[in-house]
């Protein structure tokens, strides 16, 4: 039997201080550039080496950013989301969703990472 892949989803508040070269990451997503089908959310696509996000260490490529300084990122055009980050100020608070892949046991077996039941 094949194993099953589940995802452990957690949320975290990350406070970044803008560095000399900015926050140091790229994003994909938005209502006009969906990264995930039927999801116009904003996702971290690149953490730049030695940037503020990389030095902090908590933000990861693949994370979904839910809000910036308390402002929801739902239903935004891609460029509007980019502008929001660029105008977010020196101290930037990010609410992020981490999605950790969990390899469970064979199908039919409820592994430790399975939240059901």
């Amino acid at each position: 039997m094949n194993g099953r892949v589940d995802y452990l989803v957690t949320e975290e508040e990350i406070n970044l201080t803008r560095g000399p070269s900015g926050l140091g990451f790229n994003i994909v997503g938005g209502t006009d550039q969906q990264y995930v089908s039927n999801d116009s959310g904003i996702y971290v696509s690149r953490i730049k080496e030695n940037g503020a996000a990389a030095l902090d260490g908590r933000l990861q490529e693949g994370d979904k950013i839910l809000s910036v300084n308390g402002q929801d990122l739902k239903n935004l055009l891609h460029q509007d989301a980019v502008d929001l980050f660029r105008n977010a100020g020196y101290a930037v608070s990010l609410r992020v969703q981490h999605r950790l892949q969990v390899q469970n046991g064979p199908i039919g077996h409820r592994g430790e990472g399975d939240p059901s039941g």
């Epitope: 926050l23 790229n26 696509s45 693949g62």
Partner: nanobody, 128 residues
Framework: DVQLVESGGGLVQAGDSLRLSCAAS????????MGWFRQALGKEREFVAT????????NYADSVKGRFTISRDNAKNTVYLEMNSLKPEDTAVYYC??????????????????????WGQGTQVTVS
Amino acid sequence: DVQLVESGGGLVQAGDSLRLSCAASGRPFNMYDMGWFRQALGKEREFVATVSWTGSSTNYADSVKGRFTISRDNAKNTVYLEMNSLKPEDTAVYYCAARGGGTSVDSDYDVGEFEYDYWGQGTQVTVS
């Protein structure tokens, strides 16, 4: 991190074809711009081709235009380099590379040709 493993290299005759593959693992593949580079013995590494994270944009070095084709299969987490009409000067170690696509939240700037975050170990292509 992203792990990249190249395969498909080998020894071929001039005029032959070869298809290189690069399998990626470790992160969501479909958000990465992917590139192929090569390095001949005693020479510097050079750009060959890139494909954007959406797959909608490709770019090629002048030396391979019309002969090489880069493509990606996001379902298989794999990027390919189809090489036709191979020449002895195509002999090199071919490297696959990845970097997150999308837009910088900091500023609009042109990403450097070699500014990739993850690199494979390479596969040897020899054209006799």
